[in-house]
C-alpha cells in the first residue's frame, strides 16, 4: 500500500533559467494523505538554508498532488541561487532536494545566454 508519509517531489539537481523582471513561480510538489503539512521555502547560503519569511506563497491543489508555490513578482537579480522546501509532519522535518535558479539580468536580455550556455558556463549569470 502507498506510504502516507509526506513527500516533496522537487527533482534532484533541477535547474531553471529565468529572466530578471519576469514573474516566476517556483513549485514544490507535495504528496500527503490526510492533513496538509506546514511547508516553508528557504534559500541556501553555503551549508545553511535561510527561511524565506516575508515572501508571497500559495497552494495549488490538484487531484493526486499539491503544489506549494513561491512567487517571484518580479524576479530580481539577487534571486539567483538554490532553494529548498521543507515540511513539518508528525514532528519530523522533511527536506526536498534543492533547485537552482539561474537569473539573467534584464539589462543583458538582448544577449541572454541560452539554457545550454548557463548549464555549462554558470559564470555567465552576472554579466
Amino acid at each position: 500500500k502507498e506510504s502516507c508519509d509526506v513527500q516533496l517531489y522537487i527533482k534532484r539537481q533541477s535547474e531553471h533559467s529565468i529572466l530578471a523582471g519576469d514573474p516566476f513561480e517556483l513549485e514544490c510538489p507535495v504528496k500527503y494523505c490526510a492533513n496538509r503539512p506546514h511547508v516553508t521555502w528557504c534559500k541556501l547560503n553555503g551549508t545553511t538554508c535561510v527561511k524565506l519569511e516575508d515572501r508571497q506563497t500559495s497552494w495549488k491543489e490538484e487531484k493526486n498532488i499539491s503544489f506549494f508555490i513561491l512567487h517571484f513578482e518580479p524576479v530580481l537579480p539577487n534571486d539567483n541561487g538554490s532553494y529548498r522546501c521543507s515540511a513539518n509532519f508528525q514532528s519530523n522535518l522533511i527536506e526536498s532536494h534543492s533547485t537552482t535558479l539561474y537569473v539573467t539580468d534584464v539589462k543583458s536580455a538582448s544577449e541572454r545566454p541560452s539554457k545550454d550556455e548557463m548549464a555549462s558556463r554558470p559564470w555567465l549569470l552576472y554579466r
Epitope: Y9, K11, R12, E15, H16, S17, K115, A119
Partner: antibody, heavy 120, light 112 residues
Framework: EVQLQQSGAELVKPGASVKLSCTDS????????IHWVTQRPQQGLEWIGR????????RYDPKFQGKATITSDTSSNTAYLQLSSLTSEDTAVYYC?????????????WGQGTSVTVSS | DVVMTQSPLTLSLTIGQPASISCKSS???????????LNWFLQRPGQSPKRLIY???KLDSGVPDRFTGSGSGTDFTLKISRVEAEDLGVYYC?????????FGGGTKLEIK
C-alpha cells in the same frame, strides 16, 4: 512492454544534421529527466546529456556541446536529439534513457537505440 | 570530469565460478543528500543496457540475488557469486552524482 520507443535507423551524409526521437509510453516525461547516451562501434557507453522536459533545461558533457542539441515536446511525451555537422566519427548507436526520479535517480529504462551511419 | 576506471577489461570464466568487477572514481560519489549515485548496467550482445544495481547496492527487480554491489566513496565492486550463461555481456558502472555523468569503460564477461 517497451516504454521508450526510439525512431528508426538513419543513413546520413557528412556535414548533414539528423534529429532522433524518443517517445515515452509509460511515464509523463515532465516528471523525470531524459538522457541521451552514445555508443560507437565496438566501444563503450558515453553520456551526451539530459533534459528536464518540465522546463527545457539541458545539461551536456562539454565534449558534445555544439554537436548535440536535446529538446522535448511534452504534448507528445517525446524527447529529441539533434546532431549537427556530422562526420564519420558520429557513426554510432544513440540511446535515450529515463531517469526514474524520487528517490533513486538512476537510468531505469532505456530505448532500443537508433543507429546513425554517416557515409557519403 | 569524474573518471570511472573499471577493471578487469575482460573476465573469462566457466559457469559456476564467482566474478568480481571493480569500479574506481576519481572523486567521491557521495552526494550532498547523503546518497551515493553509483549504478551498474549490463549490456548483453545486441541489446540496450539494462540496470542491475542502483545506489551502490540495491538490486533492480528481477535481478537474481547472486549479484551484489558494494563500496563507498570512490571504490565500488560488483560481484556475481556463481556465473551463469545469461550473465555474459559488458558490465558498466555509471555515476549520477556529478556533471557530466560518466560511465566506466566496461568489463566484458565471457563464458569459457
Amino acid at each position: 512492454e517497451v516504454q521508450l520507443q526510439q525512431s528508426g535507423a538513419e543513413l546520413v551524409k557528412p556535414g548533414a544534421s539528423v534529429k532522433l526521437s524518443c517517445t515515452d509510453s509509460g511515464f509523463n516525461i515532465k516528471d523525470t529527466y531524459i538522457h541521451w547516451v552514445t555508443q560507437r562501434p565496438q566501444q563503450g557507453l558515453e553520456w551526451i546529456g539530459r533534459i528536464d522536459p518540465a522546463n527545457g533545461f539541458t545539461r551536456y558533457d562539454p565534449k558534445f556541446q555544439g554537436k548535440a542539441t536535446i529538446t522535448s515536446d511534452t504534448s507528445s511525451n517525446t524527447a529529441y536529439l539533434q546532431l549537427s555537422s556530422l562526420t564519420s566519427e558520429d557513426t554510432a548507436v544513440y540511446y535515450c534513457a529515463r531517469e526514474d526520479g524520487y528517490p533513486y535517480y538512476t537510468l531505469d529504462c532505456w530505448g532500443q537505440g537508433t543507429s546513425v551511419t554517416v557515409s557519403s | 570530469d569524474v573518471v570511472m576506471t573499471q577493471s578487469p577489461l575482460t573476465l573469462s570464466l566457466t559457469i559456476g565460478q564467482p566474478a568480481s568487477i571493480s569500479c574506481k572514481s576519481s572523486q567521491s560519489l557521495l552526494d550532498v543528500d547523503g546518497k551515493t549515485y553509483l549504478n551498474w548496467f549490463l549490456q548483453r550482445p545486441g541489446q540496450s543496457p539494462k540496470r542491475l544495481i542502483y545506489l551502490v547496492s540495491k538490486l533492480d527487480s528481477g535481478v537474481p540475488d547472486r549479484f551484489t554491489g558494494s563500496g563507498s566513496g570512490t571504490d565500488f565492486t560488483l560481484k556475481i557469486s556463481r556465473v551463469e550463461a545469461e550473465d555474459l555481456g559488458v558490465y558498466y558502472c555509471w555515476q549520477g552524482t556529478h556533471f557530466p555523468r560518466t560511465f566506466g569503460g566496461g568489463t566484458k564477461l565471457e563464458i569459457k
